[in-house]
Interface confidence: low
């Protein structure tokens, strides 16, 4: 039996388990009519601020402030065990990892915790292996580890060659930096970029609401507001209007639909992303704006930016051949619904295309390397990389981004298989509407 992979980031709690929180519980309240554009812009700014402060509060909690550790034995929640545990063979219990010997970083259904790394000689242990985090090793003073040779620490040079001056010290991740006295070019020949390094000590929580943050927020809000008003009046809006019915105009919309989306966790992000994706004219050359109206664009206000981009893609040679828009069957969060299908993709995408696919989706080589190391079994590698992609990209990680990447790689069969699988699994469906108006 293969080890199953770790399913989701610890911070997000793996699978979303939302209870009806205060936001979800609120109903639609009658009140004075306000232009919906303004509401959305204000909501967008508030979301940006709240998201930032949420990040701060999560990251800056001291260990003792975080959730209390689980008991050694507990029951799996939705088939998953919390970080620091693995699942028992009968699937009934969560068993704690052994401190200093093995660990698990995410909610998981691993049959065995992952082994702790031991620091090499020539490395210092920055932090020990705990049940929820692997050992963190760093090169000893006077040595460094390069991207190109991550397996060993190399000695830093003691000085610069003649005619050069030292501009950067030896750090655990870089050798000393030397530049030519006269030209100011690096030893490698590159012109050194002026870098502004912002350091923040782990113990000092960042200010949740700094002055610069407020200024940026207000500026962004003003710009967004102006652009939004302009867009509402422009040709672009008329083209996109059928898909975002009732957001700009005072009436004619379906307030029920908007309220319902705002009650779903994460829906605010979707609405915000719709605004952002619509307000990116650089991505939408004018000739690409031919979009026909679907009969009934139900649920379109749930599109992620990746998907809303597809509303504006160029007409293909054969319109009747266009792929229809895939949306979650249960009106769930598109990214989360997609995430739930990742497990099966390893069987549908040829192994040789896994890494090219992930590069196409925007993962760096180093992120791919880390994902491969974290993967508990061969089949799990693609899953782990896709999870990394989702965690990195957020709601831009749409099903269509993934399918398009496969298309670009020439993996048409894999693309078709995945599309078929998403439909047959019952998790996705085609957006109802005319076949002609279907979007890539």
């Amino acid at each position: 039996m293969e080890q199953r992979g770790q399913n989701a980031p610890a911070a997000s709690g793996a699978r979303k388990r939302h209870g009806p929180g205060p936001r979800e519980a609120r109903g639609a309240r009658p009140g004075p009519r306000v232009p919906k554009t303004l509401v959305l812009v204000v909501a967008a700014v508030l979301l940006l601020v709240s998201a930032e402060s949420a990040l701060i509060t999560q990251q800056d909690l001291a260990p003792q402030q975080r959730a209390a550790p689980q008991q050694k034995r507990s029951s799996p929640s939705e088939g998953l065990c919390p970080p620091g545990h693995h699942i028992s063979e009968d699937g009934r219990d969560c068993i704690s990892c052994k401190y200093g010997q093995d660990y698990s970083t995410h909610w998981n259904d691993l049959l065995f915790c992952l082994r702790c790394t031991r620091c090499d000689s020539g490395e210092v242990e920055l932090s020990p292996c705990t049940t929820t985090r692997n050992t963190v090793c760093q090169c000893e003073e006077g040595t460094f580890r390069e991207e190109d040779s991550p397996e060993m620490c190399r000695k830093c040079r003691t000085g610069c060659p003649r005619g050069m001056v030292k501009v950067g010290d030896c750090t655990p991740w870089s050798d000393i930096e030397c530049v030519h006295k006269e030209s100011g070019t690096k030893h490698s020949g590159e012109v050194p970029a002026v870098e502004e390094t912002v350091t923040s000590s782990p113990g000092t929580p960042a200010s949740p609401c700094s002055l610069s943050g407020i200024i940026i927020g207000v500026t962004v809000a003003a710009v967004v507001l102006i652009v939004a008003v302009f867009v509402c009046k422009s040709l672009l809006w008329k083209k996109v209007l059928p898909y975002l019915k009732g957001i700009c105009s005072g009436g004619g919309g379906d307030p029920e639909r908007v309220d319902r989306s705002s009650q779903r966790p994460g829906a605010e992000d979707n609405v915000l992303n719709e605004i952002v994706s619509i307000l990116q004219p650089t991505q939408v050359p004018e000739q690409e704006m031919e979009v026909q109206e679907p009969a009934e664009p139900t649920g379109v206000n749930m599109l992620s930016p990746g998907e809303s981009e597809h509303l504006l893609e160029p007409a293909e040679a054969e319109r009747s051949q266009r792929r229809r828009l895939l949306v979650p069957a249960n009106e769930g969060d598109p990214t989360e619904t997609l995430r739930q299908c990742f497990d099966d993709f390893a069987d549908l995408v040829p192994f040789d295309s896994w890494e090219p696919l992930m590069r196409k989706l925007g993962l760096m080589d180093n992120e791919i390397k880390v994902a491969k190391a974290e993967a508990a079994g061969h089949r799990d590698t693609l899953y782990t990389m896709l999870i990394k992609w989702v965690n990195k990209t957020g709601r831009d990680a749409s099903v269509h981004t993934l399918l398009d990447a496969l298309e670009t790689l020439g993996e048409r069969l894999a693309k078709q298989k995945i599309e078929d699988h998403l439909l047959s699994s019952g998790k996705f469906m085609y957006l109802e509407g005319n076949a002609d108006s279907a979007m890539s």
Partner: antibody, heavy 119, light 113 residues
Amino acid sequence: QVQLQQWGARLLKPSETLSLTCAVYGGSFSGYYWSWIRQPPGKGLEWIGEINHSGSTNYNPSLKSRVTISVDTSKNQFSLKLRSVTAADTAVYYCARGGSSGYWYFDLWGRGTLVTVSS
Amino acid sequence: DIVMTQSPDSLAVSLGERATINCKSSQSVLHSSNNKNYLVWYQQKPGQPPKLLIYWASTRESGVPDRFSGSGSGTDFTLTISSLQAEDVAVYYCQQYYSTPLTFGGGTKVEIK
């Protein structure tokens, strides 16, 4: 029927590098950890280290400074390099598969390669 | 490192008789959370690689005759061959897989008396 086939130089001089390769035939390469274990003539077994398909390794601290285990997933092979050998490294070297789900016991072994270090 | 000590070094038993091999670990290999002992037994015949007999201290590997059984917990373990057969002549090793480095016992040679 999964089989492990191993090969490499059998006679070395002191200070040379021992190099062995193990190929996995007829079964899954992924989902397992693959180990090297050695047994000096007439003595017990010593675990050298292990690797998985993605190149994640664990080594025995007593040998770690001299050992490198690498993997070639395209060929379903993994390799052992032991630097600066001495007569004490004379042993039968086995490649082995970690049990299902990555447990640290060995349910499948190669036939072994006797490596002799002699000047 | 966990040190595994086997006794006796060698054992001569008549065909059909019981053979008992002991293995002691320098620290407990019982993981309290799942109540499992991370200990395994192997059989090695001359010129052959070891063969897995028992894991989790008492779970027989498929295809292993039921005359082989494992018992014990914590630090003290026993491999028992209830009725020795000619083909059981071999060296038997215990191994802990509670933590790395993985360590083996010195082996017990079983012969026919």
